[in-house]
């Protein structure tokens, strides 16, 4: 029979390659039975995970699963790093695996002088 424990389906060692300046939604797939748990996001800083208090989040409900979404509008270069979601369920803290965002800063890449510009200097 199906377990009624809360499950957080973030894949171990999962990675997302994203561009600075773009919007991005980081999803934490949450499976629960009756009452939706309280879910939060945090960002890893060494071995500690710093809670993301003032960030926009939302829920998306699907038939068999719900998603707790962390919004990046837009993605900034310092959003690079590893994130984890956690749920409070029946006074237990359930933690997901971490997922890593690799942010490419296209702006700084495009601002580098071209070969022609370098030659003319």
């Amino acid at each position: 029979k199906e377990s009624c424990d809360v499950q957080l389906y973030i894949k171990r060692q999962s990675e997302h390659s994203i561009l600075a300046g773009d919007p991005f939604e980081l999803e934490c797939p949450v499976k629960y039975c009756a009452n939706r748990p309280h879910v939060t996001w945090c960002k890893l800083n060494g071995t500690t995970c710093v809670k993301l208090e003032d960030r926009q989040t939302s829920w998306k409900e699907e038939k068999n699963i719900s998603f707790f979404i962390l919004h990046f509008e837009p993605v900034l270069p310092n959003d690079n790093g590893s994130y984890r979601c956690s749920a409070n369920f029946q006074s237990n803290l359930i933690e997901s695996h971490s997922t890593t965002l690799y942010v490419t800063d296209v702006k700084s890449a495009s601002e580098r002088p071209s070969k022609d510009e370098m030659a003319s200097r």
Epitope: D5, V6, Q7, L8, Y9, I10, K11, R12, S14, E15, H16, S17, P29, K31, I65, A87, I94, E95, S96, H97, S98
Partner: antibody, heavy 121, light 112 residues
Framework: EVQLQQSVAELVRPGASVKLSCTAS????????MHWVKQRPEQGLEWIGR????????KYDPKFQGKATITADTSSNTAYVQLSSLTSEDTAIYYC??????????????WGQGTTLTVSS | DVVMTQTPLTLSVTIGQPASISCKSS???????????LNWLLQRPGQSPKRLIY???KLDSGVPDRFTGSGSGTDFTLKISRVEAEDLGVYYC?????????FGGGTKLEIK
Amino acid sequence: EVQLQQSVAELVRPGASVKLSCTASGFNIKNTYMHWVKQRPEQGLEWIGRIDPANGNTKYDPKFQGKATITADTSSNTAYVQLSSLTSEDTAIYYCALTYYGSSQHYFDYWGQGTTLTVSS
Amino acid sequence: DVVMTQTPLTLSVTIGQPASISCKSSQSLLDSDGKTYLNWLLQRPGQSPKRLIYLVSKLDSGVPDRFTGSGSGTDFTLKISRVEAEDLGVYYCWQDTHFPQTFGGGTKLEIK
């Protein structure tokens, strides 16, 4: 109930390519990793690589880099491995395996029944 | 790559007797998240592999409690308290801590 459906057998000429498929039912592959594993006759298991169908990210064992290409189609809930420049060394059973991660860390939970690939002229 | 060495290669056991398989890894399988990603699989004759144990000692659903997994670091053991006829096949240890994932060479359990 989760099932992974693979074709039973393929016979291919040396030098040719082949694309093996693995269709999942009872589970959305976007929430999983899909792995491919090789087993040569009377031998052990070798991990070829895996795909994250949610974003197409792949990881390969370096010894299969250039030999195998793993793809996935989330609309048909199917993962594929394409094997190129086939030789007799590629004659084996190829298993797909579905890994999913919940908070209790499940992985390699389901295996297909395997496709027997024979490379022969 | 992490080398997984299983012993013995073949194990011949009388039904009702215990059995033990050893698996040693060439480096520690303790991950940075504090978990040890060591699994045991059973491949019955003519079938695909089926996972029995994950995270060293957690039994998959439907796996009888006569199976136990133990160990840490580089040394791991699968024990069957009383072997039954359905237990015959090839047992593999498999690690998913380090990239690439690697399997042991297998231990064939046969019934005496």
